[in-house]
């Protein structure tokens, strides 16, 4: 497959990935499958740095990030590790909260006004960011 | 100038296979998802499925799920429906369209006519 | 599946008319709809996105509004070659799903 070097058009490049911001809402695996379909996934938060990067561009609006735990255990949509990486989630969350009345808890991960995360019902729509690094070989299966 | 240009329709027996092609040009093609929507004579607009620039990720209507496979060839710019199992209801014009940002079809090719018949 | 409903069905007007086509989601799709015009034999062209947002080369008589649910497109002033018929897509979620259309003929 060919490699990116550059980002496409309306995508902002940071650190050596290339990060595109709604401007409306979706639901989470709407926004998910939004992602896929640009050959990225819903953003990674590896960093505080990152954070702040993101955090600068969405401003205090409630935005779904690549981090979900509707099987289980939390997991990263790219499968960095969640145990092991960098949190952000306001006090006392995630909390999986039932009191919505929706149905169910909480399963995904949004950036709330101030930029820290709170997980919250997945068919909410938010806003999200998709992420795609450079340089990695695209996904482009083999011709038969 | 862009342009989208289907071909390879035609009538087939019911079970039986075709495979649609869609030449682009104009654009880049390779950084742009592109779907498949089909029209049967005298109805409206049914979205068929959808392919990423790589073609790493597809989705399909309930309707031709696990009988359609889409697929791509960035180094010939062509995008290609495979249509197995077809049926009588599978019959209409076929086009290929460009996705846009706001996830709707910004450029349409002139449609292929499949007609599936015994 | 999200299912999507116009009205009217058909709608006759006079050149320098104003028209207004109004489009219903079965569920909120915010502001993800988009409008074509599609002439007999012809493939659709997308006239507009997002809702409202006018496509390059479209006339600026075509204008769209709505969020949520229900959504309007609106011709300031009919043309002869406006006669054609107005279709909205739902591009909230897969799967895409299309109106039935609206039919504008001459009266």
């Known amino acids: 497959g060919s490699e990116r070097t550059c980002c496409p058009v309306n995508w902002v490049e940071h650190e050596r990935s290339c990060y595109w911001f709604s401007r409306s809402g979706k639901a989470w695996a709407d926004a998910d499958n939004y992602c896929r379909l640009e050959d990225a996934h819903l953003v990674v938060v590896t960093s505080w740095e990152e954070q702040k990067f993101v955090q600068h561009h969405i401003g205090p609006v409630n935005t779904w990030m690549g981090l979900h735990d509707q099987n289980g255990p939390w997991k990263w949509v790219d499968g960095t590790d969640y145990e092991t990486g960098f949190k952000n989630w306001r006090p006392e969350q995630p909390d999986d909260w039932y009191g919505h009345g929706l149905g169910g808890g909480e399963d995904c991960a949004h950036f709330t006004d101030d930029g820290r995360w709170n997980d919250d019902v997945c068919q909410r729509p938010y806003r999200w960011v998709c992420e795609t690094e450079l340089d990695k070989a695209s996904q482009e299966p083999p011709l038969l | 100038e862009v342009q989208l240009l289907e071909s390879g329709g035609g009538l087939v027996q019911p079970g039986g296979s075709l495979r649609l092609s869609c030449a682009a040009s104009g654009f880049t093609f390779s950084s742009n998802a592109m779907s498949w929507v089909r029209q049967a004579p005298g109805k409206g607009l049914e979205w068929v499925s959808v392919i990423s620039g790589s073609g790493g990720s597809t989705y399909y209507a309930d309707s031709v799920k696990g009988r359609f496979t889409i697929s791509r060839d960035n180094s010939k710019n062509t995008l290609y429906l495979q249509m197995n199992s077809l049926r009588a209801e599978d019959t209409a014009l076929y086009y290929c369209a460009k996705r846009n940002y706001d996830d709707a079809f910004d450029i349409w090719g002139q449609g292929t006519m499949v007609t599936v018949s015994s | 599946d999200i299912q999507m409903t116009q009205s009217p069905s058909s709608v006759s007007a006079s050149v320098g008319d104003r028209v207004t086509i109004t489009c219903r989601a079965s569920q909120n799709i915010t502001t993800w709809l988009a409008w074509y015009q599609q002439k007999p034999g012809k493939a659709p062209k997308l006239l507009i996105s997002?809702?409202?947002s006018l496509q390059s080369g479209v006339p600026s008589r075509f204008s769209g509004s709505g969020s949520g649910t229900d959504f309007t497109l609106t011709i300031s002033s009919l043309q002869p070659e406006d006669f054609a018929t107005y279709i909205c897509q739902q591009a909230n979620s897969f799967p895409f799903t299309f109106g039935p259309g609206t039919k504008l003929d001459i009266k």
């Open positions: 997002a809702a409202s």
